[in-house]
Amino acid sequence: ASVGLPSVSLDLPRLSIQKDILTIKANTTLQITCRGQRDLDWLWPNNQSGSEQRVEVTECSDGLFCKTLTIPKVIGNDTGAYKCFYRETDLASVIYVYVQDYRSPFIASVSDQHGVVYITENKNKTVVIPCLGSISNLNVSLCARYPEKRFVPDGNRISWDSKKGFTIPSYMISYAGMVFCEAKINDESYQSIMYIVVVVGYRIYDVVLSPSHGIELSVGEKLVLNCTARTELNVGIDFNWEYPSSKHQHKKLVNRDLKTQSGSEMKKFLSTLTIDGITRSDQGLYTCAASSGLMTKKNSTFVRVHEKPFVAFGSGMESLVEATVGERVRIPAKYLGYPPPEIKWYKNGIPLESNHTIKAGHVLTIMEVSERDTGNYTVILTNPISKEKQSHVVSLVVYVPPQIGEKSLISPVDSYQYGTTQTLTCTVYAIPPPHHIHWYWQLEEECANEPSHAVSVTNPYPCEEWRSVEDFQGGNKIEVNKNQFALIEGKNKTVSTLVIQAANVSALYKCEAVNKVGRGERVISFHVTRGPEITLQPDMQPTEQESVSLWCTADRSTFENLTWYKLGPQPLPIHVGELPTPVCKNLDTLWKLNATMFSNSTNDILIMELKNASLQDQGDYVCLAQDRKTKKRHCVVRQLTVLERVAPTITGNLENQTTSIGESIEVSCTASGNPPPQIMWFKDNETLVEDSGIVLKDGNRNLTIRRVRKEDEGLYTCQACSVLGCAKVEAFFIIEGAQEKTNLEHHHHHH
C-alpha cells in the first residue's frame, strides 16, 4: 500500500513483496527489500527509533537507494506495519505483517506488564482496548472483572480488529477494574496483557465559597473559608487559593472529598482555608480555584479585617420619614460595624416589640401606618463584643388625607325653610391641614334628573357640572367664611362654613378639601321647602338615655293634617330621578309615629317625644302636612343623631418629670367621653385646690404650678369622671435643689 501524495519527480518506494498484508509463521525469517529514487529509511512495529538489536537494515548490493530489512526468527510481537519512506517526505510504502504465533496470539507492547485504558461514562462513546493480534482472523472476546463478565463481538458496536484491538461502548466496562482480551485456538485459551480501567470525568459544575460574602473579622480572630466544588462523577480535583498574604505562617489548608448520597450524579470536594490570628494585612480578595485538568472554576470573596470591634450609623440613615395613613413604612437601621450590632427600637422611650402590626429588626416595619404611629423612634445599636452603643432618632410623620367629619347623607336629607339664612359646615381633619377647601354648587334638578348616570353608595349624586360658589347666578346668594381652626375630640380640625343668605332654591353643595397626600369631599343636599318646620328641643344632639322632642310647626291657615313618620331602612333608589327627596312620593317606606298636637294663635305644633333615646332611635324623621287648598302634601325631613355613651378616657400620658426649685411646671390632661367627663387633680391622693401658685384652666385640663418648692414634690393624679366611670393618669414630679430662705417670697400651700 502507498501512503502520501504522488509527485511528478518521485515514484513511491517499491517493496519486494507486493502485498498489503503478509502472513508468516513464527520462527521464520522476515526479509523485505525496498527500492526507490533517493535516500530511504525503514520504520517497523514496537520500535520507531531503529535501535532494535534483532532487526537488521542493510544496503542492497545491487544498487543505490535500496535497503533490505531482515528479522530472523520472528515472533508474534513483530506483527504490525512495516513502512519504507523517503527521508524528509511523506512518501512511503507500507506492508502489514502478521507473524502467526499460536502460543502468543496477542502482540505485547514493549515492556508493558499491564496497560491503562481511559474511559468516560458516556453512552455514545466507545473505547478501544489495544490488544492487537498476530493472527488476523482470531476468535477474540473481552473479559472484564470484577464481577467477571465476557463480551463477544456482535457485528455492531462490539468488535475486534487485529490491527486496532477490541472496540466496546465505554459504559459497558466502566464498572470494571481491569479488562483483557482472550483468544481461543484449538480449545486453548490465550490472554492479552491486563488493562487497568480508569474512568475519567472532568466537568466541574460550580465552586462555592462559604461564607460567600460580607465576611468581616477583627484583628486576632480566626478566618475559616470553605470552598466546595461540585463535579460529575469520576473526577479528581486540585484546589488552590489566592489571597493577600499567601505566605501566611498561620495558614492551614485541608482538602477532602465529601460523601454524597448513593445514586447521586454528583461528587463534592471541599477545601478549607484557616488563618488563625488574622491581621490587617490579611484583608482583601480570597479566591479559591478548583481544577480537574480539563476544567477550572474559581470563586472569590472579600474579607474585611477591622482593627477592633466598632459600631456606627451609615450615612444613609434617615432622620425624617414621611408616610400616609395605611401605607407600609420601612425604616432601615443603616449601620457600619463589626460584629453586626444588636438592634433595639424605641418609640418615645418605650421599647418596641414585634407583633402582627409592627416588626422591629434590622428594618423597623409598620404594616399599616396610622396616626398614632407618629412620633420619635430611637434605634440603639450595641456592639456585642465591646458593648459600645450608638443611638439615632428618626421622626415619623404620618400624613392623613382630608377626612370630612359630618356624616355624608345619601337620601333623604334635611329640608330647609324657604327664605331662611342657613349655614353649611365642613369640618376637615387632615395632616398636614388642607391647603385649600373649595365649595361648589349645582341646582338640585340638574343633578337629580340625569338618567345616564347610575347611583352608587360612594357617589350618590351623579353631578358633573359643579360650579364655583363665586358664580351663584340662578342659585342662592352665598358667602364663604374664613376657615376656622378648632380642637375637636383632641384633634386640630379645619372648619369651613358656607352661609346661604336666603334659602330660595333647592341645590347641592360640595366642599372639597385637598392636602399634600389626598383629597376629600362631602356633598350636602340643600332642599328648600315652604312647608312645615322642624326643630329639636333641646336644640342639641341627644346622648343615649337622654330625652329629646321633635317639634313640627306649621301655619294653621295654610296646612292641616300634620303627621310624624320615621323613614324605615331602604335600599338605594334605582332611578336617578328619585333623588334627592322622594319621601313625599313614597309613603310606603314611612312608619307613622304617635305625637301630641299643640296650637297657638297662628301655628299648629306636632310634638314627637323620645324618652331615654337609644341608638336605634337615630334616623330620618319626616313631618308631613297637607295644603288646605290644593291638598298637596309637603314633607320635611330631619336627621336625628343619638350620641353613644362613652366612658371617660384620657389621651396622652402624664410623664414623670424633674424640675428645679423656683421653676414652673405645666401639664395637660385631655379627657374625652360622652357625657363629657369632669376633670379633677390630686396630689398624693388628696384633692388639689387652686391658689396663687396652683392654676387650673380649660375645665381643669391644664395644670400650672408656679415657682415650685420642695413641698410640691409628689405623685400627681389627673382623674376624669362621668356617670359611666372614671379614668386616671399619674406622674411623679421630682423637685431638685435647696430651698432658699426668704421672707419676700410668696409661698403657696396645699389643702
Partner: antibody, heavy 117, light 112 residues
C-alpha cells in the same frame, strides 16, 4: 497583561525527544488550568494535553498518549510538554493556552516542531 | 470523538456587509446542566487563536457586539454584522461537551 510565551521547538528526527516550555506572566499561574493545542500545516487545531492547577491531573489526546507528558512548575510560572518517540505527524505549531471554565481564553504565539529525518 | 463540520471553508466578503458561519456537530452539545458547550475562535493571519464566543452565545470580554453566536443542540451559527478589515482570518468552532475537545476545520474570512 496576560502573556504566554512558548519555546523549545525545533527540528527533530523521528523517534527523537524534545521538551517545550511555556512561560506565563501577568496572572496568577497557579489558579488556572493549562493546555497544549497544536496545528499541523494547513490543518485544523488539535487539542493535545491538559493539566490541573496543581499538576495532579493530566489528560492527553489518544494520538499522543504514552509518548507526551504535560507538567507544570507553579513556582516558576512555567508549563512543559515532554515529547518522546516523535513522529512525522507530530509536526505542528504548538500553542500553550490558559483555561478557565473549560475555555481557552489566552493563547501564546506558538512554537514550531518539525519531525523529520 | 465528536466530529465538528464547518461551512463554508472560505468566505469572501465586502467590508460593511453581514456574514454567517455555520458549524455542525455529530452530537448534541447541549449538556444536562442546560448549557450548550460550543466556542468560537478567530485566528488572524500570523497570530494565535482568540476566544470570541463561549457557551454558544456569550461574548468573551473585549469582543465587539458585531459578533453574535446562536444555535440549537447540533447546529450553530456565528454572525458578524458589518464586517471590518480587522475581522479577516480563520474562524474555528470548538466543542467542550465531551473529552477530547475537538475543533472545526475552520472558515477563512477574506476581503474581496
Amino acid at each position: 497583561e496576560v502573556q504566554l510565551v512558548e519555546s523549545g521547538g525545533g527540528l527533530v528526527k523521528p523517534g527523537g525527544s524534545l521538551r517545550l516550555s511555556c512561560a506565563a506572566s501577568g496572572f496568577t499561574f497557579s489558579m488556572y488550568g493549562m493546555s497544549w493545542v497544536r496545528q499541523a500545516p494547513g490543518k485544523r487545531l488539535e487539542w493535545v494535553a491538559s493539566i490541573s492547577i496543581g499538576g495532579s491531573y493530566t489528560y492527553y489526546a489518544d494520538s499522543v498518549k504514552g509518548r507526551f507528558t504535560i507538567s507544570r512548575d507553579n513556582a516558576k510560572n512555567t508549563l512543559y510538554l515532554q515529547m518522546n518517540s516523535l513522529r512525522a505527524e507530530d509536526t505542528a505549531v504548538y500553542y500553550c493556552a490558559r483555561e478557565m471554565d473549560g475555555n481557552y481564553d489566552y493563547w501564546g504565539h506558538g512554537t514550531t516542531l518539525t519531525v523529520s529525518s | 470523538d465528536i466530529v465538528i463540520t464547518q461551512t463554508p471553508l472560505s468566505l469572501p466578503v465586502t467590508p460593511g456587509e453581514s456574514v454567517s458561519i455555520s458549524c455542525r456537530s455529530s452530537k448534541s452539545l447541549l449538556y444536562k446542566d442546560g448549557k450548550t458547550y460550543l466556542n468560537w475562535f478567530l485566528q488572524r493571519p500570523g497570530q494565535s487563536p482568540q476566544l470570541l464566543i463561549y457557551l454558544m452565545s456569550t461574548r468573551a470580554s473585549g469582543v465587539p457586539d458585531r459578533f453574535s453566536g446562536s444555535g440549537s443542540g447540533t447546529d450553530f451559527t456565528l454572525k458578524i454584522s458589518r464586517v471590518e478589515a480587522e475581522d479577516v482570518g480563520v474562524y474555528y468552532c470548538q466543542q467542550l461537551v465531551e473529552y477530547p475537545f475537538t475543533f472545526g476545520s475552520g472558515t477563512k474570512l477574506e476581503i474581496k
